[in-house]
């Protein structure tokens, strides 16, 4: 049903990381416009993007309300120049979103290690505790603020000498590991949220090695 | 239903070497690393090492480097393990395992190999 | 590498009776450590990870404790299907060693 010259959006699909939230879907629009809607299943609707020829919309402002809600998007579409047109049922044509939680859901961005200091045969490995745009109290929450110990990274750290690697894992954003006195070490961190089932693991960080501008090294 | 089926027994010549397969299901095969455990007739579990189905990087203990060689085939959601040189010391169950992070969770039923002339 | 030493190597005990099981770690682990129980014939099936959290389906007779160096698995209220292997894992890092194993014996 709809308008003649209107076609409704397919392909809805949620694009996120680090709860940065984008709704894409298709077609690109040819004689129409598009609204979003959000609600959360128990929520009313809200309005997002209005008669926009884009085909995506950013309802991140939305999502980081509460992180751990599920929800559902859809997608109107208009005829160009006469947005009070309706589908021959009354109601303009639109399509549903998959649901989508973004706690359980957002990729997890790629990790950066942020420094590393050796002192004698320990290096403390720092990972960059990213900042998200989840708010609480006016003030905006790190990755680490948002998932507690459900988010861990792990090294994964080699001798620059060698191809052998080695891991380890912490619940914080802190590694202390034994190296060799004198062997220049390669580093590289990834994040995991154990629990989960789909997008569990984000990219590797950029490889850090010591004897570069990153790392601080201290003979005791 | 979460599976790792594995070949079946194997039994070889010493200095041959064997490739053992790890058949995976009812998961997505490249969110979780695959782990590779030995164990010896009556004897403790030796970890061999692991490989990161998603991009194929390998970890393997230092007693298995030059023995293991960890491969993966995403379209068919199977882990492989090589081994070369073997000897009657290799004679083994073998055990692949999915890797959840905080611990192993669903294992392989296991492949007897017999090293043996 | 981080050494893992699991004691008793064996033990007897009865029906209906509690037994622990130890494992002590060269270096902290923090609590990256899970435990398994193997039957004759059989893989190892996860029992403990994060050294305290049942796994799903487990009794709730195992439990798990301890942090750092040291840490305990209890079995408490024994059953006869409890008479079998037990081993502990270090998965803080690699390589990700088990421990020695406890054979638990029906006295």
């Known amino acids: 049903s709809g308008t003649t010259n209107t076609v409704a959006a397919y392909n809805l699909t949620w694009k996120s990381t680090n709860f940065k939230t984008i709704l894409e879907w298709e077609p690109k629009p040819v004689n129409q416009v598009y609204t979003v809607q959000i609600s959360t299943k128990s929520g009313d609707w809200k309005s997002k993007c209005f008669y926009t020829t884009d085909t995506e919309c950013d309802l991140t402002d939305e999502i980081v309300k509460d992180v751990k809600q599920t929800y559902l998007a859809r997608v109107f579409s208009y005829p160009a120049g006469n947005v009070e047109s309706t589908g021959s049922a009354g109601e303009p044509l639109y399509e549903n979103s998959p649901e989508f939680t973004p706690y359980l859901e957002t990729n997890l961005g790629q990790p950066t290690i942020q420094s590393f200091e050796q002192v004698g045969t320990k290096v403390n490995v720092t990972v960059e505790d990213e900042r998200t745009l989840v708010r609480r109290n006016n003030t905006f929450l790190s990755l680490r603020d948002v998932f507690g110990k459900d988010l861990i990274y792990t090294l994964y750290y080699w001798k620059s000498s060698s191809s052998g690697k080695k891991t380890a894992k912490t619940n914080t954003n802190e590694f202390l590991i034994d190296v060799d006195k004198g062997e220049n070490y390669c580093f590289s961190v990834q994040a995991v949220i154990p629990s989960r089932t789909v997008n569990r693991k984000s990219t590797d960080s950029p490889v850090e090695c010591m004897g570069q501008e990153k790392g601080e090294f201290r003979e005791i | 239903e979460i599976q790792l089926q594995q070949s079946g027994p194997e039994l070889v010549k010493p200095g041959a070497s064997v490739q053992v397969s790890c058949k995976t299901s009812?998961?997505?095969?490249?969110?979780?690393?695959v782990y590779w455990v030995r164990q010896s007739h009556g004897k403790s579990l030796e970890w061999i090492g692991y490989i990161d189905p998603d991009n194929g990087i390998t970890f393997y203990d230092e007693n298995f480097m030059g023995k293991a060689t960890l491969t993966v085939d995403k379209s068919s959601t199977t882990a492989f393990m090589h081994l070369n040189s073997l000897t009657s010391d290799d004679s083994a169950v073998y055990f692949c395992?999915?890797?959840?992070?905080?611990?192993?969770?669903?294992w392989g039923q296991g492949t007897t190999l017999t090293v043996s002339s | 590498d981080i050494q893992m030493t699991q004691s008793p190597a064996s033990q007897s005990a009865s029906l209906g009776e509690s037994v622990t099981i130890t494992c002590l770690a060269t270096q902290t682990l923090d609590t990256w450590l899970a435990w398994y129980q193997q039957k004759p014939g059989k893989s190892p099936q996860l029992l403990i990870y994060a050294a305290t959290y049942l796994a799903d389906g487990v009794p709730s007779r195992f439990s798990g404790s301890g942090s750092g160096t040291k840490f305990s698995f209890k079995i408490s209220s024994l059953q006869a299907e409890d008479f079998v292997n037990y081993y502990c894992q270090l998965v803080y890092s690699s390589p990700s060693t088990f421990g020695a194993g406890t054979k638990l014996e029906l006295k």
């Open positions: 009812g998961y997505s095969f490249t969110h979780f690393n």
């Open positions: 395992a999915r890797d959840v992070t905080t611990a192993v969770d669903f």
